[in-house]
Amino acid sequence: EEELQVIQPEKSVSVAAGDSATLNCTVSSLIPVGPIQWFRGAGPGRELIYNLKEGHFPRVTPVSDPTKRNNMDFSIRISNITPADAGTYYCVKFRKGSPDVELKSGAGTELSVRAKPSAPVVSGPAVRATAEHTVSFTCESHGFSPRDITLKWFKNGNELSDVQTNVDPAGKSVSYSIRSTARVVLTRRDVHSQVICEVAHVTLQGDPLRGTANLSEAIRVPPFLEVTQQSMRADNQVNVTCQVTKFYPQRLQLTWLENGNVSRTEMASALPENKDGTYNWTSWLLVNVSAHRDDVKLTCQVEHDGQPAVNKSFSVKVSAHPKEQGSNTAAENTGTNERNIY
C-alpha cells in the first residue's frame, strides 16, 4: 500500500497586503479516511487556520469543494492579507477517530507579506525659534514590510545631513516602523522654506512617499524698529512714525507712550506679505507741540508673538523756534534710545 503524501508544492508564497493568498495542498490518496486541517506554525503553539468541519474562518475559503466525492485538493485562499498573516502554513492530514489522530503534515509554505509604508507624518518643534537657532523635525512611517527602507530629508530641495534614523524593531517582525529626526538651522529667509521627508520602499511604484512641514510654523523673525519725525506742520503738530519691519508671524501689538503714559495701542492685522514672507507695519502719532511746555518723550513699544516688548524712544524738544524743526529725523536703531529734535 502506497504511503499517503501531503503535498505543499510551494515552499514560499509572497503577497501584497490587502490581496489574497492561495496556499496549495493536495493528498496522494483518499485513504485513510480523516480530515485535513491547516495550521500556522508547528509544534504545540501552532494556530488553527482552517478546519472544514468546525469553526468560523471568515477570511479562509477552500479553493475546491471539499465536500465533493474523491476530493484530493485541500488548497485554501486567505483574503485581505495583512502583515500579521506572515508565517509558515502547514496542511495536516488526520486519521478519523475519537479523537482524530495526526497522520502526516505537508512540508509547509512560508507566506511572506509585502506592505507599503504609511504616508510619512512630519512634526516640527512645539515652540518657535529665531534665526541661527537649530530646530528638530521628526518624520514617522509605519506598517511596511520588508524592513529595507530609505528615508531622506530635504530643505528647499537640498538634502539635509544632520539626520538620525531608526527602523524598529531591530529583529524579525511582521511589519516595521521608521522614525527619523532632522536638525535644521534657521535663517531669517526661512519663512517660505519647507522641509520634506521622503520615504522609498520596494512596494512603492517608483515614487517615494513624501511628508512635508513648513518652516513658517517653526520660525519667529523679530522685527526691526525705526522711529522718525516728519517736518513740523504749520499747526504746530509733529508727525512721528514707527516703522516695524521684517517680522514673522504677523501677531504683533504696538503701543505709543507719551512721557511714559499709554497714548494708543494697535494690533497688526491683514498686512501685505513681503516677498520673503515677512511683514512690515508703519504706525503714526501726531504730537501737538504747543500743548507741551517741556520736551515730550515718545516711545514706540512693540510686543511680537508673545515675546518681551522692544522699545524705541526719543524726545521731541519743545522749542521757542518750531519753524527751525529739521525734517525726517530718525532715532537710532539700537536699544532704548532718546534723541533731541531741534
Epitope: S14, D148, T150, A200, Q205, G206
Partner: antibody, heavy 116, light 109 residues
C-alpha cells in the same frame, strides 16, 4: 496584459530615434515601467524606468543619451544622439505587482540598428 | 554601482541533470534578486523573484536561494525546454537601480 515595442529601424548616427511601448490590460498610472536593451550576442542591460506618476530614473551610464516619457497608454524611449554602440534589441517591461525589484511582463522587443 | 557576477558563463548538461547557477553581488542586496530565462530571439521570462519565490506558472523544478551577496538558481531535473540563457538581476533599495549578471548559457551535452 501585454506590452508591444515599436519604432525599431535602421537609423543614422546622431539622428534621434523614438521607440514606443504600447500597453494593454493594465494602467500605466499604476506601475513602474522599464526599458532594457540587448546588443547582438550580449547580455541584458538596464536603461531606465518611469514611475507610476511619470518621473524617470536612469542607469548611471545613460548621461542624457536617453529620455523616457509616457502618455496614458504608451511609454517612449527617445535615443537622443545614437551611435553604432546603441545597436541592440530594445525591450520594455513592467514591474511586478508586489514591488519594483523584478519585472514580470516583457514585450517581444524591437531591433534598432544604428549605422552610417 | 553594484556588480553582479554570474557563474559559470556556460555549461553543458543532459536532460534529467541537476543544474546550479550562482550569482554574486558586489555588495549586499538583501533578497532583491530575480532570475530570468531567455531563449534566442525572445524576451526574458521571469522565473524567481525576491531570491526564492517561484513566479506563477513556472515549473517547480526551478528554485532559488540565497540572500545578501550570494544567490543560487537550481534546476532539479533539466528538461529539453530548459536549454536557454539564464540571467540574474539585482535591485538595490538605496540606489534604486537594477543590474544584470552577464548570463549563463545552458547547452545540451
Amino acid at each position: 496584459v501585454q506590452l508591444v515595442e515599436s519604432g525599431g529601424r535602421l537609423g543614422q548616427p546622431g539622428t534621434s530615434l523614438t521607440l514606443s511601448c504600447t500597453v494593454s490590460g493594465f494602467s500605466l498610472s499604476s506601475y513602474v515601467m522599464g526599458w532594457f536593451r540587448q546588443a547582438p550576442g550580449k547580455g541584458l542591460e538596464y536603461i531606465g524606468i518611469i514611475s507610476s506618476s511619470g518621473s524617470p530614473y536612469y542607469a548611471s551610464w545613460v548621461n542624457g543619451r536617453f529620455t523616457i516619457s509616457k502618455t496614458s497608454t504608451t511609454m517612449d524611449l527617445k535615443m537622443n544622439s545614437p551611435t553604432t554602440e546603441d545597436t541592440a534589441t530594445y525591450f520594455c517591461a513592467r514591474v511586478g505587482p508586489l514591488g519594483v525589484d523584478y519585472f514580470n511582463i516583457w514585450g517581444p522587443g524591437t531591433l534598432v540598428t544604428v549605422s552610417s | 554601482d553594484i556588480q553582479m557576477t554570474q557563474s559559470p558563463s556556460s555549461l553543458s548538461a543532459s536532460v534529467g541533470d541537476r543544474v546550479t547557477i550562482t550569482c554574486r553581488a558586489s555588495q549586499s542586496i538583501n533578497s532583491y534578486l530575480a532570475w530570468y530565462q531567455q531563449k534566442p530571439g525572445k524576451a526574458p521570462k521571469l522565473l524567481i523573484y525576491s531570491a526564492s519565490f517561484l513566479y506563477s506558472g513556472v515549473p517547480s523544478r526551478f528554485s532559488g536561494s540565497g540572500s545578501g551577496t550570494d544567490f543560487t538558481l537550481t534546476i532539479s531535473s533539466l528538461q529539453p525546454e530548459d536549454f536557454a540563457t539564464y540571467y540574474c538581476q539585482s535591485w538595490h533599495y538605496i540606489s534604486r537601480s537594477y543590474t544584470f549578471g552577464q548570463g549563463t548559457k545552458v547547452e545540451i551535452k
